[in-house]
């Protein structure tokens, strides 16, 4: 399966939208930095087949969608930017789902690496827990926004490696 060029453009647009979403100066939030334990190894793309890498990317985007779809998120971010953000994430989910369907029967390995999916879910659970503990403060959201932008940048690297594997 070829991930379309539009997917890569959508990823870049997602990062641009997230960059615009900031409501307060991040300089006031240094002390709120937190180690979420980003599962770097799941995005190295070396240890599993293409279908499994796609399923990990899909899980990350789905979890991001869930995180920013909460009422607490809606109360924090600009509604217009959020709508654009949802549209881009939805586009990426569709691309990845189409790709996963094409991979059915192509590889002998399972379509999903359950351990990897669980690792990504636990990562997002840590983010949600942090937001809860910080009472969804503006700085907590700024820290989370920075973390998700970093996650998307790193996942974009995995997508590029997948494209080069074609």
């Amino acid at each position: 399966c070829d991930l379309p060029q539009t997917h890569s453009l959508s990823n870049r647009r997602t990062l641009m939208i997230m960059a615009q979403m900031g409501r307060i100066s991040p300089f006031s939030c240094l002390k709120d930095r937190h180690d979420f334990g980003f599962p770097q190894e799941e995005f190295d793309g070396n240890q599993f087949q293409k279908a499994q890498a796609i399923s990990v990317l899909h899980e990350m985007i789905q979890q991001t969608f869930n995180l920013f779809s909460t009422k607490d998120s809606s109360a924090t971010w600009d509604e217009t930017l959020l709508d654009k953000f949802y549209t881009e994430l939805y586009q990426q989910l569709n691309d990845l789902e189409a790709c996963m369907m094409q991979e059915v029967g192509v590889e002998d390995t399972p379509l999903m690496n359950v351990d990897s999916i669980l690792t990504v879910r636990k990562y997002f659970q840590r983010i949600t827990l942090y937001l809860t503990e910080k009472k969804y403060s503006p700085c907590a959201w700024e820290v989370v926004r920075a973390e998700i932008m970093r996650s998307f940048s790193l996942s974009a690297n995995l997508q590029e490696r997948l494209r080069r594997k074609e």
């Epitope: 991040p26 300089f27 939030c29 002390k31 709120d32 180690d35 700024e142 920075a146 970093r150």
Partner: antibody, heavy 121, light 107 residues
């Protein structure tokens, strides 16, 4: 390879203006902040201020607020430090350094080679 | 502003010695503490971040410890290339502040 390359040494007279630069390469320039650090001859390190190149938001040390201006041009991955009227006490080595912003990552992990500014009549 | 105080300001040691430098913050900075090494005419180099994390490429003889207000940089066995000035820096809040430096000289 991540690199921060600073502009060359400058010799200026008191009252003159100056703008020095720091060009980033080998990484996403807008994903990191750029900080500026002063080191006067034979002295320690002093943090001057910082910029987020993604939106040019800045923060200054109270000691340097109003004395210098930090700016950036993300289209050419370059940050700047400027003075409108130099003083002899501005004579120092100036370093730029990369900061991860709000991400849990090493602070000031890459530094420029430094720009020596000499102000003398 | 958060004041950072290093001790000693200088020390003399021999190759193979265990060297300890301390840094005290004027208020709790949890683990937002970095250590840098600077050699004459060179830019500072990050050694330790978040009080105890070893920066990539830095030899394991360097280690950091502490939390709250008191921190330590330890060089387990001093090497010829370790003679330099060492700075601590808090990154809890702006303005970011450095210690005054500790110069490690050859005995």
């Amino acid at each position: 390879e991540v690199q921060l390359v600073q502009s060359g040494a400058e010799v200026k007279k008191p009252g003159e203006s100056l703008k020095i630069s720091c060009k980033g390469s080998g990484y996403s320039f807008t994903s990191y902040w750029i900080g500026w650090v002063r080191q006067m001859p034979g002295k320690g390190l002093e943090w001057m201020g910082i910029i987020d190149p993604s939106d040019s938001d800045t923060a200054y040390s109270p000691s340097f607020q109003g004395q210098v201006t930090i700016s950036a041009d993300k289209s050419i991955s370059t940050a700047y430090l400027q003075w409108s009227s130099l003083k002899a006490s501005d004579t120092a080595m100036y370093y730029c350094a990369r900061h991860p912003g709000l991400n849990w990552a090493p602070d000031f992990d890459y530094w420029g080679q430094g720009t020596l500014v000499t102000v003398s009549s | 502003d958060i004041q950072m105080t290093q001790s000693p300001s200088s020390l003399s040691a021999s190759v193979g010695d265990r060297v300890t430098i301390t840094c005290r913050a004027s208020q709790s900075i949890t683990n937002f503490l970095n250590w840098y090494q600077q050699k004459p005419g060179k830019a500072p180099k990050l050694l330790i971040y978040f009080a105890s994390s070893l920066q990539s490429g830095v030899p394991s003889r360097f280690s950091g410890s502490g939390s709250g207000t008191d921190f330590t940089l330890t060089i387990s066995s001093l090497q010829p290339e370790d003679f330099a000035t060492y700075y601590c820096q808090q990154s809890l809040d702006f303005p970011l502040t450095f210690g005054q430096g500790t110069k490690v000289e050859i005995k």
